[in-house]
């Protein structure tokens, strides 16, 4: 867990922070950066996927988009599902901030969330036959 | 609405209990659109190491193991949130930063036909 937290010399300009916690500015750097979604790779892929949005008002960001593979197998040149190949999810960890209510007090916790980004077509290693 | 600045616990909670983040570690080789992983390291960021995918081929690997240029390998990109030390070098003061990473590659039918 806490890689890179303690080996820095603390400059005089660093803000004072209570023990066991850290100061986090949630004004996002590069907020307006956008992924080009116009290429429709999710529907053109041989392992196509759909998107579902999960929403949680106590999470920042409140919206997290998850990809969902459409098929067990992969789409062949004829547009048919080939079950001898496998569609599999590609996943990436990201950070979110969780707001926790304990009685009248509110605390904040960083969380690692695993997001499914898309799908890829792989040769199987598991053969579901007898 | 979240306040602009919050104090958060130093321990980062892991919600990934159902699945293993390292699970797809061999997909880069088994995919029909294989990729190489490149290490991106930045001590001013948490996590300090992020792996970037680079598609190995323009085309996709066919059933014979050859590159088929009638199909395209393309990167799957995702915006993720990381922590950036702010001010720089401070051990316990961060700002959220959005970065674009290539996570892997997928094989797609082309929309641009690069033919003579």
């Amino acid at each position: 867990g806490s890689e890179g937290e303690t080996f820095f010399q603390k400059p005089e300009s660093c803000p004072p922070v209570p023990g066991g916690s850290m100061k986090l500015d949630i004004g996002i750097i590069n907020e307006n950066q956008r992924v080009s979604m116009s290429r429709n790779i999710e529907s053109r892929s041989t392992s196509p996927w759909d998107y579902t949005v999960t929403w949680d008002p106590n999470r920042y960001p409140s919206e997290v988009v998850q990809a969902q593979c459409r098929n067990l197998g992969c789409i062949n040149a004829q547009g048919k599902e080939d079950i001898s190949m496998n569609s599999v999810p590609i996943q990436q960890e990201t950070l979110v901030v969780r707001r926790k209510h304990q009685g009248s007090s509110v605390s904040f916790q960083l969380e690692k969330v695993l997001v499914t980004v898309g799908c890829t077509c792989v040769t199987p290693v598991i053969h579901h036959v007898q | 609405n979240f306040p602009r600045t919050v104090m958060v616990n130093l321990n980062i909670h892991n919600r990934n209990t159902n699945t293993n983040p390292k699970r797809s570690s061999d997909y880069y080789d088994r995919s029909t659109s294989p990729w190489n992983l490149h290490r991106n390291e930045d001590p001013e960021r948490y996590p300090s190491v992020i792996w970037e995918a680079k598609c190995r081929h323009l085309g996709c690997i066919n059933a014979d193991g050859n590159v088929d240029y009638h199909m395209n390998s393309v990167p799957i990109q995702q915006e993720i949130l990381v922590l950036r030390r702010e001010p720089p070098h401070c051990p316990n003061s961060f700002r959220l930063e959005k970065i674009l990473v290539s996570v892997g590659c997928t094989c797609v039918t082309p929309i641009v036909h690069h033919v003579a």
Epitope: Q66, R70, P89 | -
Partner: nanobody, 123 residues
């Protein structure tokens, strides 16, 4: 946390039919495949069938092909296993589960299991 409730098992004569149901809750937004598995006394749990939530595409183990049919109701988050021409060797406890990596999911990667539903086929 994923919760799985299987039902529909029972005692049936060889050649008979049963329809199993599975209700799944707590699935992640990226869940895309569900499977049926079975475990006979003294044997390891084995894969029976899988279905894609979105496309409805299916995969069966060879011994049940043309006899078993898996279907799903995406809105209700339920899957079903229609079992026809049952044989004594189909006797087992049947389980359903989310397949987080589809057909690539290994048996040791399933975190949660339901209680299962007993299917007994008498000769």
């Amino acid at each position: 946390q994923v919760q799985l409730v299987e039902s529909g098992g029972g005692l049936v004569q060889a050649g008979g039919s049963l329809r199993l149901s599975c209700a799944a809750s707590g699935l992640t937004g990226s869940s895309y495949a569900m499977g049926w598995f079975r475990q006979a006394p003294g044997k390891e749990r084995e894969f029976v069938a899988a279905i894609s939530w979105i496309s409805g595409g299916t995969k069966y183990t060879d011994s049940v092909k043309d006899r078993f049919t898996m279907s799903r109701d995406y809105a209700k988050k339920q899957v079903y296993l229609e079992m026809n021409s049952l044989k004594p060797e189909d006797t087992a406890v049947y389980y359903c589960n989310d397949m987080p990596y589809g057909l690539d999911t290994r048996m040791d990667e399933y975190v949660y299991w339901g209680q299962g539903t007993q299917v007994t086929v008498s000769s």
